[in-house]
Interface confidence: medium
Amino acid sequence: APPRLICDSRVLERYLLEAKEAENITTGCAEHCSLNENITVPDTKVNFYAWKRMEVGQQAVEVWQGLALLSEAVLRGQALLVNSSQPWEPLQLHVDKAVSGLRSLTTLLRALGAQKEAISPPDAASAAPLRTITADTFRKLFRVYSNFLRGKLKLYTGEACRTGDR
């Protein structure tokens, strides 16, 4: 992927809108939308003010760990859906899109240098462990996906892209 493709706001917005569509389609859906187990996902809460003052390398650690856990969670959701007796087609479509979207975002972040940033900060070893929550429905899973993209990921890419411009 081109190194700074994710710095084009339209790219992230595309994934954000996909995530929100998925969230919207599962609103009020009970019958087909239970995960039937608790899946661990990243806690998307962001202390905006603390985040803003964080070193970009520390931000990269949080984003990289969160993205990895979220990708695992969505893949687990996809597996559960495949194994269910009658997967709901619109849900299947959005889960598949989320899997594909997270793979693409991982590639785009790697191209931006997030992985290197996440390894190199001097205080990376002492970083607080990633906070997690659980999701028991696809609605919650998609809500976390949507929140993660427009929370930590958007804040991180905004800062990393600005830093790269200097």
Epitope: T44, N47, Y49, A50, R53, R150
Partner: antibody, heavy 127, light 107 residues
Framework: QVQLQQSGPGLVKPSQTLSLTCAIS??????????WNWIRQSPSRGLEWLGV?????????DYAVSVKSRITINPDTSKNQFSLQLNSVTPEDTAVYYC?????????????????WGRGTLVTVSS | SYVLTQPPSVSVAPGKTARITCSGD??????VEWYQQKPGQAPVLVIY???DRPSGIPERFSGSNSGNTATLTISRVEAGDEADYYC??????????FGGGTKLTVL
């Protein structure tokens, strides 16, 4: 229950400095989990966020682009309050001025939601 | 700078559903808040994070946000809901942006 009590003059002459204070009860101005804002409202400009201060091991502030060159927001820890100073005012700055508290730490939106407001102070800029 | 656009007024009969819209470029990718303001009073937060209600706000108030439009929905409207409603979003690093406000009239 957080309460915000505003004080300051209701009339300021053009080119002078507008000064308002917001006294906090039920929370601390130097809390690590809150942020303290000034917002104004006028018929011509509607609601307009002016700036924020917050304490995270040290003091930080952010100001709206529209007033950045003229605004200062300061904490007063001894009195548990914070103040607004707006320099070189013009009649355009005539508005109801509110102080408000926002709480960082929710999903990335709640931190900007202004959950507690002062009652507002009408400030008229006129000679 | 970012602009949020609201209709100046919305009218609704008591017991019916009122919908107030707020539009902005790709607004669905930002979080939206809604404030209720009655004459002579400070605004009151009724919705944050697009659709979450602070404690004390009735369930009749709900919100959604997708594409370019956020919507505040008030079901079973009561006379006491008559007020000005403002949407707001933190659409950039430092500036919180408010919409121009919508006057809700209960017929």
């Amino acid at each position: 229950q957080v309460q915000l009590q505003q004080s300051g003059p209701g009339l300021v002459k053009p080119s002078q400095t507008l000064s308002l204070t917001c006294a906090i009860s039920g929370d601390s101005v130097s809390s690590n989990t809150a942020a303290w804002n000034w917002i104004r409202q006028s018929p011509s400009r509607g609601l307009e966020w002016l700036g924020v201060i917050y304490y995270r091991s040290k003091w930080y502030n952010d100001y709206a682009v529209s007033v950045k060159s003229r605004i200062t927001i300061n904490p007063d820890t001894s009195k548990n309050q914070f103040s607004l100073q707006l320099n070189s005012v013009t009649p355009e700055d005539t508005a109801v001025y509110y102080c408000a508290r926002s709480v960082p730490g929710g999903d990335p939106g709640l931190e900007h939601a202004f959950a507690y407001w002062g009652r507002g102070t009408l400030v008229t800029v006129s000679s | 700078s970012y602009v949020l656009t609201q209709p100046p007024s919305v009218s609704v009969a008591p017991g019916k559903t009122a919908r107030i819209t707020c539009s902005g470029d790709n607004l669905g990718t930002y979080y939206v808040e809604w404030y209720q303001q009655k004459p002579g009073q400070a605004p009151v937060l009724v919705i944050y994070d697009d659709s979450d209600r602070p404690s004390g706000i009735p369930e009749r108030f709900s919100g959604s946000n997708s594409g370019n439009t956020a919507t505040l929905t008030i079901s079973r409207v009561e006379a006491g809901d008559e007020a000005d409603y403002y949407c707001a979003s933190f659409a950039s690093w430092s500036d919180s942006v408010f919409g121009g406000g919508t006057k809700l009239t209960v017929l």
